[in-house]
Interface confidence: low
Amino acid sequence: IVLRPSRVHNSEENTMRALTLKDILNGTFSYKTFFPNWISGQEYLHQSADNNIVLYNIETGQSYTILSNRTMKSVNASNYGLSPDRQFVYLESDYSKLWRYSYTATYYIYDLSNGEFVRGNELPRPIQYLCWSPVGSKLAYVYQNNIYLKQRPGDPPFQITFNGRENKIFNGIPDWVYEEEMLATKYALWWSPNGKFLAYAEFNDTDIPVIAYSYYGDEQYPRTINIPYPKAGAKNPVVRIFIIDTTYPAYVGPQEVPVPAMIASSDYYFSWLTWVTDERVCLQWLKRVQNVSVLSICDFREDWQTWDCPKTQEHIEESRTGWAGGFFVSTPVFSYDAISYYKIFSDKDGYKHIHYIKDTVENAIQITSGKWEAINIFRVTQDSLFYSSNEFEEYPGRRNIYRISIGSYPPSKKCVTCHLRKERCQYYTASFSDYAKYYALVCYGPGIPISTLHDGRTDQEIKILEENKELENALKNIQLPKEEIKKLEVDEITLWYKMILPPQFDRSKKYPLLIQVYGGPCSQSVRSVFAVNWISYLASKEGMVIALVDGRGTAFQGDKLLYAVYRKLGVYEVEDQITAVRKFIEMGFIDEKRIAIWGWSYGGYVSSLALASGTGLFKCGIAVAPVSSWEYYASVYTERFMGLPTKDDNLEHYKNSTVMARAEYFRNVDYLLIHGTADDNVHFQNSAQIAKALVNAQVDFQAMWYSDQNHGLSGLSTNHLYTHMTHFLKQCFSLSD
């Protein structure tokens, strides 16, 4: 149980105030984290509050400004990148967002040796992606879907690809679906460890159907946004991987890396690339039916100037109960012998654990085990492996950092974070310097977040990097809600939930209940993290109880729970929310005539289906940017969990799981449907179809659209959205304004 201390005695209560909606919309109680920008084993860069770029040396304790805020301001730079030889800095300005990760920008190169910007052979604009080589100061960049290389910043560029074309061929950057659903990056190029080779992906979207939507803007005529976007079952991008020698790029040109035969026999994806050495690379591939993944280790053949991927270096990962991996297939972390590696995948009991692969996957040595899951491998050194898991005290919504000593026999395991600040910190991530000489720990809660610096050998805390003192002081006179994390055991299923309770919560009274749901495959909502957000306000000021429940399909509790939703999205996720609500009613403090549910994206889909479940449990609910039919969503994501919408595969469940099919069932609930018209991710089409079905069924409902807003509904739309939803809920719960 996690109870946030109220921090005061009753005598002080008259000086305390509840959270207001304005507090939330203004970000009054937002927190800061500190992630060092590591540049060596003992040095890191950080952008100071006054915008100077400062280099810190942990061992000498010295710091100095390498780039002044004056230089940054001279080109309106919002970001920077130091070349590994420390001779140049790129300055990024004119940031222009595209999709979730992608953006374009203007780049200037500043020469630190003479204190001037590099003139001559300036970079074109806007650039889609730019990065330094890992050694020296070579530059690779993507401009108009083609890749260019500079040996030095002032040199003329060498053009590597020539076939790049908007919305057709993408070189070195992903198309929409690879960016959002596979790579989760804005880039698709990778330097070898010493910068000898550059690997890149080419995505051919020529045959992909295009989603088109209006962007209204301010002009007389709206413009049309066209995105090659493969929906479930549609034609997918065709991917190829190339590698070029950057020392002599014109010598043989880009060489294609062969696709494993068992993958190439049908539609497939490329999922990630990991360099092992300058002349060894590891590629991961995935069948379109995403239950088979192949990891292929390829070697450079000097004599032929080609890349060879022997079958003996192909490692197959297959799931017989669901899809391969968790949300993504995990990536390998190679050991110092440059052939064996560590990787997280399901063990025989169906829990994701770290395995060590030396020759074949069948002979893998299991490194961690138990009825919990290893979540991320941060770093492998010669003698230690650092990873995160949710093992400690059997709370799946926690994250602690562990060290396994692999240099000694038998290997010993130590929890680095479990007892550091036990009440305040139960959810950590980490960032390691070269060779793990030092590391930063970033604690996200449940108390106020704190970032600290540690010695990589002894784990001793060296200093606090950020402790959010201002936030702590600002919260001293705020009546925060109480939070508890507990579990329900129902029919051999464990349902973890987080309940957010009003500050003066009294179990003998009755409270309106709001369920906040996401519920997507491999997600987790019940986490021991700090947040002061909209639902905190609803509990603090409006006296609501808010609950979040992790049901079937959610992550980090084993494959049985995770893969329960395989090929049947929209069934068990909804059932488990309903089951939890019934259990909450049994607790005695919920007013069963005032229960609502709300969610965004996948959560909008689940909330819509829950409202249309015909149970009579919910008085009202909100769906923000919901999926309404899996036929409308992206192939890579949808097919991972649902298979194909064909008669000989899973078309029947695609049809049965739509929100539209349940239009009649909305008759007895108050439904608020919200969507941005320029949503590139979950297309406005989804809500348009719900609205049409409700109109055709003559069912009353409320709706709000946000013109030219995407899936995030950002800026002023955010304020409008939360104000609108607050009014809707207060009306539903008969709370006075």
């Epitope: 159907p209 295009v210 989603i211 479930a232 079952g233 919408p645 089409q685």
Partner: nanobody
Framework: EVQLVESGGGLVQPGGSLRLSCAAS????????MGWFRQAPGKGRELVAA????????YYPDSVEGRFTISRDNAKRMVYLQMNSLRAEDTAVYYC???????????WGQGTQVTVSS
């Protein structure tokens, strides 16, 4: 019985135009994605235009983009292919097709011949 019937083919000079029509019966055409394919002698079947159920999304390969336009009238259960600036290499039998998802076309018409020649 699902039926697709094409019409509008014929002989046309290079640079000329033709409008092909496809009448659908036996199913609710708005349910399906519709496409126009062509097959030249000795060659495989090639998709030249596709349109989503509502007509909101269309697709053309590079070879016809800007010259061909696909449209549909769900009320009349018709799909059209407007072909402008025709070239000799556009000579083929043109087929109308319907499918339950993109690129899975399970219903086909008998085809209509288009010949571009001077």
């Amino acid at each position: 019985e699902v039926q697709l019937v094409e019409s509008g083919g014929g002989l046309v000079q290079p640079g000329g135009s033709l409008r092909l029509s496809c009448a659908a019966s036996g199913f609710i055409s708005s349910y399906y994605y519709m496409g126009w394919f062509r097959q030249a002698p000795g060659k495989g079947r090639e998709l030249v235009a596709a349109i989503s159920r509502t007509g909101g999304s269309t697709y053309y390969p590079d070879s016809v983009e800007g010259r061909f336009t696909i449209s549909r009238d769900n009320a009349k259960r018709m799909v059209y292919l407007q072909m402008n600036s025709l070239r000799a290499e556009d000579t083929a039998v043109y087929y109308c097709a319907a499918g339950d998802i993109n690129y899975h076309y399970n219903y086909w018409g008998q085809g209509t011949q288009v010949t571009v020649s001077s």
